[in-house]
Structures are given as structure tokens and as C-alpha cells.
């Protein structure tokens, strides 16, 4: 709709097109027009602020009748709203509706909200929260609307006494005079920024901050920038010479997606190292997942992520990023004994060799080392060269022989991607040469000895044949593209669920194979296209639905914000800024495009999996039908808590993780297993969090365990875009044996924590497996 | 044509109550507001409270709350407001008016004469 | 409590324009104030003109017109005729509540 995420809207009533506005603080309906009484705008904590009577939308529950009401913003009724799908609801879940023309709040209410001239829910744009600079305030973000001389700000204002747009970062500013700069997105580096040609970028150094990690990063984000990344020696210097620069600050790199090493959270590569080797990237039990940045030595250093901190932010000079066609398929070929693939030839070389002679026997092959550039790439590697259970490690390209550390591709081609293991890339200090292998299993990268006697894989140019309408073995009708073994055809026709076919996406990589087909849909009307996954009995647990009615487990789970918010529903992928994104869907009256997919080869089977009947490890516990393996950390038995990093940690240290789980029966005997085991009120942490940035907030489990349930009740916390890691309640309460999964208003047992609160925990193993000592 | 009809004028007694009321004809009752004025003799107008007819919720005047209560009945589609502890200084002309969703008092009533006497 | 103001007494003559205004004592007038504006007849004949800042109501001549102006809210009578003498009230919105101001009685001759 062109309108930016914090402008005002209209609020349609989608079953009669009227609008809602406020008449002398009741709720009616009138005939829609972007007159200024009928705008409203999200503000800070999930409230609705109406422009023209300058009050928030609420519900008075303390009356008999729930009185739906304009209240003060700074009033304690209950303020905020939140969407589930196109319904409104605020307190005890009661949904806006509309009835006889007033705006009133029950709770079985099924009325659809939009944001006038548009299809978009009221939430499809979130109010972004603006973090500031100067000011008083250490960078908190500002609270909309604020209030000065009676009037209450619902935007950053410009006067002549501050140097920029400016906001309170309290409700009451006359009360407490918090304030800060506005940090906003704005075109070129003017204001807030430093600009440096060399480097192609502009910078902005917030020193008076103190911002966690994740609240550092969605400051830049929302300004269309990141954190800082560091990608060569020069542009170190240039930080540590910088005058007035915070001593110690954030800086974009982190390891917060389960089982992945660090990362830039802008995505660059991470090929250029200077860690310090006092807080090192492979942390003990202790260690922490996020990275700070010394600006005198220039080190780089592994902290805790919710440490208060300044940081930097960067964005690039121009935006034009050069998209290079990887997923396209070309016919290739190659002489007999290597595999080809899009224009390459690949040969898995199963003699162990260091990584220097592994070299030389590329080299006398016409060929190198394989450089990796792309996720395409990877996929070749873990699904062609291997099979995917092959946990041996094998050579590539990629070697540093500096100090400090620059990894650099054998065959001289431009590191673009790096795709680093858990706490890899983990240099030893001043110790060269460096070199990587990837393990078969995930194609993920390890830093070795290049002593090291290992397998390694050549890579050279194959013979690209001519283009044929359709892509080899697809069906020879137009619009057929190929993906591995695999063909898919985008049908644009939009129509309800399982229409045209049941699509089912199993990795990460058929997932940005998908994306990458979706994207010409980025700039048009926000398109969807179904997806075969389906919530079938209602209960709140997502299967593909297959050929004949299959039902077959989630492998991969690709969830948007949220998501999945509801039971019963079938779920379709977003276009647009979340390409790819999963959204539970009404599966009769929603509408969307259609990619078919055709195997040349059957069906793969079902993994193999743990059995039930497997023991436990000594000291571990389990219950009938389980597949895994519990110990239970808590205060009877351990010195502290710990916050869920530390705990994550400490479970991985025995070969474990957190717990996790797939199914809505899993949980519920879980649960009751636990409560038998200790007396009193327990929070436990367990796998479940939305630490990446790569997430965009939704839920992962930390051990890979896709995720298929509805998991995280939508009740309301007002920090909830914060609170990144889940704990279960459990408590002893021998008088009740019914438990509901998702739906349960009178005990939500399962609930979002800030990551540094310091909890009891619970390790688990896949039955049959040794765990460490 | 929308009206609204007010009660006739009442004579009571110091500390006694009256209720007068306000019938609306001629529109959906429901869908609009019902605000109640006074003017006291020479003097400007005061507001008492609103009340929505639709849910029967109310805002008052802080100086009017436990002077004043107003209610709705929707089958008669009438409002009413009771005065309570009548002193000489509640003597005074009331009006009831209504408005729709743009706000403007469209519609009033003809005022209802109060006299607090001994 | 907030207090409202208007000119106690204006003179215009037929055919000019006339502009009454309302101020608050707690600051500036703003749309967040639904500035309401009711004319008084002889006989205590009582007629909406102006609701929220500048909605006029149904029937009521365009010569009559809201606005605010400055930090007050204004009532134009653009054309004045004779029959627009009244006394004329402007009513403002606080925190659910009316305050209405003292009038402004408007002299055509």
C-alpha cells in the first residue's frame, strides 16, 4: 500500500467497509475517508493511539459490562491490542467487533479488521520501536505518544532547543525529562552519520548508549542499517583511530541461531577474524553468543548478549546489490568420475590428505579446492557429494595464512559466503596457516590444522549445453523449472488451499530455492502462495498433507512472526520484505498462487529415528512412547541457575540441548513426567527461543527440532519482542491430570523469558545416544 | 424528522428528587449520543454528562457526579436524568441533544423548568 | 478546571464577515478539543452549528463556518444577516467532558 510502517491508517470494518473512529470516547462507525478523525497509528507497547483526540483505544475491565473506551494513554486501563490474523484483541482476549455501529469488545467475536486502502491486517506493519542518541536517556527507545503542555506526541519533534527530531523516552516528560535525538531512517548520511567513500559506507557511533545486543540490532535495523561488520584490516584501523569512539561497543557479529557458528548479522562474510584470544569465539560452558569490539586494540570479543553496551551501526553509500542468479538450473558436462551442477564439475576424493597435497591433487586435475559461494553451493555439497548421514570431515578451499586472520579461497574467487559451525571460526592465537573442512552431515565449516589428514573435494569449470524451453527432465510444458531431481511450476491463478497440488518444502535449501522463484512477486501486491502444510484435526499441529492424503512430519519449519498464531488453518508463504515466510491461512476463503512440484525420482523415505524402547543413559529419565532422554537441572540439585545461553551451553557440554518437541501429545506427557519428579513450582528453560536476528521473531528449537506446533501462548507481555527464550512452568498437582496445548487460558504453562534471567533447566538426548562425561 | 420531547416543567421540595426524560422519535435511538445542559436563569449553559443509549455508558461533569444520573430506556427509546438533594441552586432550565457520528449537537430538546422551592 | 472564554459581545452589519473565538486556559485549542459551537434564539431555541473544530451540521447555512485560528477556536459567519443575531456558545472537550464558555452575543444591525 506505500505507506510506511509507523504512518497513520484507517481502521476498516472488513465484514461492512466502514471505519471506526472515536465520538466523545465511545467507538462507532462512519463512512471511510482519511479524514483526520479516522486515523490512528500504532504506539509503543502495543497500543492504538487515535490522532485526532490524541487518546488510546482500551477496555475498562474493572466494570460489569467491558467497556470499550478512548482512555488517556497514560491511564491504567488495559491499552494494548494485538492481531490474530485480521481479528483485534486486547485484555482476557476480548476481539474488537462491531455491532449495530459501535465499537464494542466480546470475546467469541470473528469481525475482520484492515488497514484502510489495503488487504493488510492491523499488525501486517508493526509500530517499530525509534532508539535514540544524546539526549539523557543511554539510547532507550522513545514511549508514544509523550506528553508536553497538555499535548500528547504520537511522532519525534523539531525545535530549536535540540539538535535534531527528538522524543521523551517516558510517558510524562514533564515529569521526568528522559529525552534522546530520534533515530529514524533517513536517505544518505546526513544527520546521525559519519560517511566514508573508502569503505563505501556510513557509519553512526552511538557512544552514550546502553543497549543489549538484540535492541542495538533492531535500533539499526530500523534505521535501514546493521550493526557494524568488519570485513578488512583497513577498515579496522580506521575504527580504532577514531576519535571519541566508546571504548567498548557492540558490533554485528553473533552466534544466536541454534547449531550455526558467527555470523555478521548483515550477512557479509566472516573471512576476516581478529578475535581476542582472552574471550575467544569457542567459549567455554560460560561463553556467550554475542561479540564486542575493543576500539583500542581493535579486538573482538565473545560477551554476553544482554550486557548494556554502546555500538555502532553501518549502512552501505548506495543500496544496489548485485543479485547473481545461483539457483538457476543449466544442463552441465563433465568428464566421467565428477558430478555436475550448474555450470561446474565436482570430484569427492576419498584418499585422507593434508590440506596442502589435498591442493596439489586438485591442482594436477585441472582443477582447485572447492570454493563455496552460495547456499546453492552448499546444497550441492551436502546433498550430491554426500549422503546426508556422513558425519566425515573433508577439505575446501578456504585458508588463512595472515595475522590477523583473512581466509581467502584457493582459487582466488572473492569470499562471498561463509557458513561457520557452532563456536567456529575458531582461530588459534597467532598460530598460521589456518585451514577449513566442512563436516558432510550440514556442510558446516571448521577451522583445522591443515596437517590434518582429511578427504577434499575438486571443483572446476564443466561444459554449460545449450538451453533447451524447459529445463532438463521437467515436463516439457512451459514455465517447468529444475532444482536438483526436482521440477516446480509457479500457477498464478489465486484459489483456496490444495487447488492446483500440495507443495512440501523439506530443507533450507529448497526454501531459498523457493524464495528466489517468489522474488519477482516482491514489488507487486503482497501475494501468497499455499504451501501443503495443514493443521488437518484442528489441534494445533501442522503435517504436510501429501499424495492420497499422507500425512508426513515436518522436517524444516520456516515460520513468520508469530507463527503459526492458530489451529485448524493451512499455511501459505509471504511475498515481499519476508519472502518465503510461513502464515497460518483459512484454508476455504483465503486466496493464494500455487508452486507445484514434480519428483523425477520417488518420494524420499522418512528418516530414521530414535525407537521408544532404547534405554536411557544412567542418571537420565524418560516415559513410554518417548524417543529422547531428560535430566533435570534443578534448585534440589544444582549450586545456581542459569540463564538459558548458559544452560543451552551446559546441556551441549554433556552432548545434549535444552528440551524439545514436535508434538502436542509430547509436551503434555512431558509435563506430567516432570511434575512427579519434584515438589513445589518450577521454571525450567527448554529449547525454545528467537535469539537470531535471521528469525525475525519467530520461535527455533535449539537443537534443530523443526517447529510444528502452535508453541507460545499469544498472551501479552509488553516487552515480548525481548523476551527471546522460553521456560515451561511445572508444578506438583496431583489433582489434575488434563493438560491443553495451546489453548489453555487457565494455566499458561509455557511462556516467554528474557534470555538473562537465571532459571533451573532441562537437558535432553535422543534415546540410544551416549551423552558426553 | 428527528425529535426530542422533554418533560414538562416540575415544582419540588428542597432535599426531594426528580427524574425528567427525554423521548427520542423519528431516528434509531441507539445510534447516537444523549447529552443533558443546564442554563440557569441569565447564565450560560453547563454540561451535565453523556450517555450512550447503545451500551448505557456514561461520562459526567465531575461537579455533576452524585448530583446526577443518567439512564436510558431503548424499548421507549427514551433517556432520563434523575437530580438528587434538590437545593434552590439546581432551579434552573434543562436541555437534552443529541449527536451523531460528526459530532454537532444536531438535535435539541425543548428544556424541562425546574424549581427547588420551599 | 479548564475555563473557556469568548468575547462577550459582538456588532457586525448585514453582509459582513464576523469571527467569534473561544480560548482555553490550559493552552492552545486543538482538534483533540471537538470544538462544538451552538447558537441561542430568543426563547431559549437552541440549534447545533458546529461540532468537532469544523463539521457543520445538517441545515445550517454554509455562511457558518469552523476552524481553528491560532490557539482558538473560531466560528466565521461569512455574510452576516440579520437573522444570526444570537447569542452563540462554544463548547470544548477535556478529558471526557464539555465545558461550555459564557457565550458571545452578536448584533446585527
Known amino acids: 500500500s506505500g505507506r510506511a510502517a509507523n504512518d497513520p491508517f484507517t481502521i476498516v470494518h472488513g465484514n461492512t467497509g466502514k471505519c471506526i473512529k472515536p465520538v466523545y470516547g465511545w467507538i462507532v462507525a462512519d463512512d471511510c475517508d482519511e479524514t483526520e478523525d479516522k486515523l490512528w497509528k500504532w504506539v509503543s507497547q502495543h497500543r492504538l493511539f487515535h490522532l485526532h483526540s490524541q487518546k488510546c483505544l482500551g477496555l475498562d475491565i474493572t466494570k460489569s459490562v467491558n467497556e470499550l473506551r478512548m482512555f488517556s494513554c497514560d491511564s491504567s486501563a488495559m491499552l494494548w491490542w494485538k492481531c490474530e490474523h485480521h481479528s483485534l484483541y486486547g485484555a482476557a482476549r476480548y476481539r474488537l467487533a462491531l455491532k449495530d455501529g459501535h465499537g464494542t469488545a466480546i470475546s467469541n467475536a470473528s469481525d475482520v479488521w484492515k488497514k484502510g486502502g489495503s488487504e493488510e491486517s492491523l499488525c501486517d506493519q508493526p509500530y517499530h520501536e525509534i532508539y535514540t542518541r544524546d539526549g539523557n536517556s543511554y539510547g532507550r527507545p522513545c514511549e508514544f505518544p509523550f506528553l508536553i503542555d497538555g499535548t500528547w506526541h504520537h511522532d519525534c519533534i523539531l525545535d530549536e532547543d535540540h539538535s535534531g527530531p527528538w522524543c521523551a523516552t517516558t510517558l510524562n516528560y514533564e515529569y521526568d525529562r528522559k529525552w534522546g535525538i530520534c533515530l529514524k531512517p533517513e536517505n544518505g548520511c546526513e544527520d546521525n552519520w559519519e560517511k566514508n567513500e573508502q569503505f563505501g559506507s556510513c557509519y553512526q557511533f552511538n557512544t552514550q548508549t546502553a543497549l543489549s545486543w538484540k535492541e542495538a540490532y533492531v535500533s539499526c535495523q530500523n534505521q535501514g542499517a546493521d550493526l557494524l561488520s568488519i570485513n578488512s584490516a583497513a577498515e579496522l584501523t580506521y575504527l580504532k583511530e577514531k576519535e571519541g569512539i566508546a571504548k567498548i561497543f557492540w558490533i554485528g557479529l553473533n552466534q544466536l541461531y541454534s547449531a550455526r557458528g558467527w555470523e555478521w548479522s548483515d550477512h557479509k562474510p566472516l573471512n576476516f577474524l581478529n578475535w581476542d584470544p582472552d574471550r575467544p569465539s569457542a567459549p567455554t560452558i560460560g561463553g556467550s553468543s554475542c561479540a564486542r569490539m575493543d576500539a583500542e586494540s581493535g579486538l573482538w570479543q565473545s560477551f554476553s548478549c544482554e550486557a548494556q553496551l554502546p555500538y555502532v551501526c553501518r549502512k552501505p553509500l548506495n543500496n544496489t546489490v548485485e543479485l547473481t542468479d545461483v539457483w538457476t538450473y543449466s544442463d552441465t558436462r563433465c568428464d566421467a568420475g565428477w558430478l555436475p551442477n550448474n555450470g561446474f564439475c565436482y570430484l569427492l576424493v576419498n584418499e585422507s590428505n593434508s590440506w596442502d597435497k589435498a591442493h596439489a591433487k586438485c591442482k594436477a586435475f585441472s582443477s582447485d579446492l572447492i570454493s563455496i559461494h552460495s547456499l546453492a553451493d552448499v546444497e550441492v555439497v551436502v546433498t550430491k557429494l554426500h549422503n546426508e548421514d556422513i558425519k566425515e570431515e573433508v577439505w575446501i578451499g578456504l585458508k588463512n595464512i595472515n595475522i590477523p586472520t583473512l581466509f581467502q579461497w584457493s582459487d582466488g574467487t572473492e569470499v562471498t559466503l561463509t557458513y561457520w559451525d557452532e563456536n567456529e571460526p575458531n582461530v588459534p592465537y597467532n598460530k598460521t596457516p589456518n585451514c577449513v573442512s566442512y563436516l558432510g552431515e550440514l556442510g558446516q565449516w571448521k577451522v583445522q590444522s591443515c596437517e590434518e589428514k582429511l578427504k577434499y573435494v575438486c571443483k572446476r569449470k564443466g561444459e554449460k549445453l545449450n538451453d533447451a524451453s524447459s529445463d532438463k527432465m521437467c515436463p516439457p510444458d512451459e514455465g517447468w523449472k529444475r532444482h536438483g531431481e526436482t521440477c516446480y511450476k509457479i500457477y498464478e491463478d489465486e484459489v483456496p488451499f490444495g487447488t492446483n497440488c500440495n507443495l512440501t518444502i523439506t530443507s533450507r535449501f529448497e526454501q531459498e530455492y523457493l524464495n528466489d522463484l517468489m522474488k519477482k512477486y516482491d514489488k507487486s501486491l503482497r501475494k501468497y502462495f499455499w504451501t501443503g502444510l495443514r493443521d488437518v484435526d484442528s489441534c494445533g499441529e501442522y503435517n504436510w498433507a501429501t499424495v492420497g492424503g499422507r500425512r508426513r512430519a515436518v522436517t524444516f519449519s520456516n515460520w513468520n512472526f508469530l507463527e503459526p498464531a492458530s489451529p485448524g488453518g493451512c499455511v501459505a508463504m509471504s511475498t515481499g520484505k519476508s519472502v518465503g515466510k510461513w502464515e497460518v491461512k483459512d484454508c476455504r476463503s483465503f486466496k493464494a498462487l500455487s508452486i507445484c512440484k514434480k519428483m523425477s525420482g520417488p518420494l524420499g523415505p522418512e528418516e530414521a529415528s530414535p525407537k521408544p524402547d532404547d534405554p536411557c543413559p544412567e542418571g537420565w529419565q524418560s516415559f513410554p512412547a518417548s524417543l529422547s532422554c531428560y535430566k533435570v537441572f534443578h534448585a534440589e540439585r544444582i549450586v545456581r541457575k542459569r540463564n538459558w545461553e548458559e544452560a543451552e551451553r551446559f546441556c551441549q557440554a554433556l552432548g545434549a540441548h535444552l528440551s524439545s518437541f514436535s508434538h502436542v501429545d509430547e509436551i503434555k506427557e512431558f509435563l506430567h513426567f516432570l511434575t512427579d519428579q519434584f515438589s513445589g513450582q518450577h521454571w525450567l528453560w527448554i529449547g525454545l527461543n528467537k535469539r537470531s536476528p535471521d528469525l525475525q521473531g519467530s520461535w527455533q528449537w535449539s537443537d534443530r527440532t523443526p517447529v510444528s506446533t502452535i508453541i507460545m501462548p499469544n498472551e501479552f507481555q509488553q516487552d515480548y519482542d525481548i523476551r527471546d527464550c522460553a521456560a515451561v512452568k511445572v508444578f506438583h498437582r496431583p489433582w489434575r491430570r488434563g493438560w491443553h496445548f495451546y489453548d489453555d487460558r487457565e494455566f499458561i504453562y509455557l511462556r516467554p523469558f528474557a534470555c538473562d534471567t537465571k532459571l533451573e533447566w532441562v537437558c535432553q538426548i535422543p534415546k540410544g545416544r551416549t551423552p558426553k562425561t | 424528522e428527528v425529535q426530542l420531547q422533554q418533560s414538562g416543567p416540575v415544582l419540588v421540595k428542597p432535599g426531594a428528587s426528580v427524574k425528567m426524560s427525554c423521548k427520542a422519535s423519528g431516528n434509531t435511538f441507539t445510534d447516537s449520543f444523549m447529552h443533558w445542559m443546564k442554563q440557569s436563569h441569565g447564565k450560560s449553559l453547563e454540561w451535565i454528562g453523556i450517555i450512550n443509549p447503545y451500551n448505557g455508558g456514561t461520562s459526567y461533569n465531575q461537579k455533576f457526579k452524585g448530583k446526577a444520573t443518567l439512564t436510558v430506556d431503548k424499548s421507549s427509546s427514551t433517556a432520563y436524568m434523575e437530580l438528587n438533594s434538590l437545593t434552590s441552586e439546581d432551579s434552573a432550565v434543562y436541555y437534552c441533544?443529541?449527536?451523531?457520528?460528526?459530532?454537532?449537537?444536531?438535535?435539541w430538546g425543548q428544556g424541562t423548568t425546574l424549581t427547588v422551592s420551599s | 478546571q479548564a475555563v473557556v472564554t469568548q468575547e462577550s459581545a459582538l456588532t457586525t452589519s448585514p453582509g459582513e464577515t464576523v469571527t467569534l473565538t473561544c480560548r482555553s486556559s490550559t493552552g492552545a485549542v486543538t482538534i483533540s478539543n471537538y470544538a462544538n459551537w451552538v447558537q441561542e434564539k430568543p426563547d431559549h431555541l437552541f440549534t447545533g452549528l458546529i461540532g468537532?473544530?469544523?463539521n457543520r451540521a445538517p441545515g445550517v447555512p454554509a455562511r457558518f463556518s469552523g476552524s481553528l485560528i491560532g490557539d482558538k477556536a473560531a466560528l466565521t459567519i461569512t455574510g452576516a444577516q440579520t437573522e444570526d443575531e444570537a447569542i452563540y456558545f462554544c463548547?470544548?472537550?477535556?478529558?471526557?467532558?464539555?465545558?461550555f464558555g459564557s457565550g458571545t452575543k452578536v448584533t446585527v444591525l
Open positions: 463548547a470544548l472537550w477535556y478529558n471526557n467532558q464539555f465545558i
Open positions: 441533544a443529541r449527536n451523531g457520528v460528526r459530532y454537532y449537537f444536531d438535535y
Open positions: 468537532g473544530t469544523n
